[in-house]
């Protein structure tokens, strides 16, 4: 399964779409910056087996998909870009699921790293809480968009490392 290669391309397309989604000048949003505590340590370890690594990436994409599928998100972003972005994420999720199924027979280790997946879930809970507290303001969404772009970029490094391990 060549997930790291295909996922890297999908990740790049998703990043481009995210970059295009900006609606207001981010320069007016500096005071809304927030520390979401990206779980960097979950993307640093080399201890993961391939299926475990994919399951963490899957959770990241799934949570991003959920975040941008809300009605508050639909009210904020340009519809055609949002649809393209959601489609791209959905494709990545499908690729990952197929890849994990392939890996199950190959690896003896557990399929999921529960602690890492929980850390990713909590990270997105913090993002959702921030949006709620900021009443889903345009600047709050800009800050979240920047954060998701950053987390995608950081997970891309993780994917490249995973590809080198193959």
């Amino acid at each position: 399964c060549d997930l790291p290669q295909t996922h890297s391309l999908g990740n790049r397309r998703a990043l481009i779409l995210l970059a295009q989604m900006g609606r207001i000048s981010p320069f007016s949003c500096l005071k809304d910056r927030h520390d979401f505590g990206f779980p960097q340590e979950e993307f640093d370890g080399n201890q993961f087996q391939k299926a475990q690594a994919i399951s963490v990436l899957h959770e990241m994409i799934q949570q991003t998909f959920n975040l941008f599928s809300t009605k508050d998100s639909s009210a904020t972003w340009e519809q055609s870009l949002l649809e393209k972005f959601s489609t791209e994420l959905n494709q990545q999720l499908n690729d990952m699921e197929a890849c994990v199924i392939q890996e199950v027979g190959v690896e003896e280790t557990p399929l999921m790293n529960v602690d890492s997946i929980l850390a990713v879930k909590k990270y997105f809970q913090r993002i959702t809480l921030y949006l709620t507290e900021k009443k889903y303001s345009p600047c709050a969404w800009e800050v979240v968009r920047a954060e998701i772009m950053r987390s995608f970029s950081l997970s891309k490094i993780f994917q490249e490392r995973l590809r080198r391990k193959e």
Partner: antibody
């Protein structure tokens, strides 16, 4: 290694135009904004403006709006500061520095070495 | 624009002294406050960001505190290499603004 390398010192006459550069390397150039800061001889730091190289969106300090133009070419990871008509009062050291944008990360954590601009008749 | 006022504008101190520089913003900037050190002929260097976070590679004798409008940079034990000019800068709202600087000189 993250680096911002600025173009060399310039000596110009009043009324001349000038474009100085700041080339980023060792990081994703479009993931950070680039700010410009002026320091006149013996004086403090003054923020001039900023650019997001990903889309060339800019913002200027009111003191510098209309006096300078900030631009970027992301294909060569370079930001620019330009004047169409220099004045003697533009004599200063100009620094570029990277800014994390809306991300929770240190502001202006890396700086260029500075470009000294001297305007004299 | 948010005005940043540093005090004192200069001070004389000896190696080993505890040095405190203050910075006041004309309106609340939460903790969006940075401190820089600049030596003659060199570019500024980031010391402290978000009011109290120590930048990577900066000695632990430097510390920052404060929130809202009043901020402090402290050097717990001044070293020979610390003689320089220090600037505060707010990153809460554009235009970004710097304090006028505090020059730390040898007594």
């Amino acid at each position: 290694e993250v680096q911002l390398v600025q173009s060399g010192a310039e000596v110009k006459k009043p009324g001349e135009s000038l474009k100085i550069s700041c080339k980023g390397s060792g990081y994703s150039f479009t993931s950070y904004w680039i700010g410009w800061v002026r320091q006149m001889p013996g004086k403090g730091l003054e923020w001039m403006g900023i650019i997001d190289p990903s889309d060339s969106d800019t913002a200027y300090s009111p003191s510098f709006q209309g006096q300078v133009t900030i631009s970027a070419d992301k294909s060569i990871s370079t930001a620019y500061l330009q004047w169409s008509s220099l004045k003697a009062s533009d004599t200063a050291m100009y620094y570029c520095a990277r800014h994390p944008g809306l991300n929770w990360a240190p502001d202006f954590d890396y700086w260029g070495q500075g470009t000294l601009v001297t305007v004299s008749s | 624009d948010i005005q940043m006022t540093q005090s004192p504008s200069s001070l004389s101190a000896s190696v080993g002294d505890r040095v405190t520089i203050t910075c006041r913003a004309s309106q609340s900037i939460d903790d969006f406050l940075n401190w820089y050190q600049q030596k003659p002929g060199k570019a500024p260097k980031l010391l402290i960001y978000f009011a109290s976070s120590l930048q990577s590679g900066v000695p632990s004798r430097f510390s920052g505190s404060g929130s809202g409008t009043d901020f402090t940079l402290t050097i717990s034990s001044l070293q020979p290499e610390d003689f320089a000019t220090y600037y505060c800068q707010q990153s809460h709202t554009l235009p970004l603004t710097f304090g006028q600087g505090t020059k730390v000189e040898i007594k």
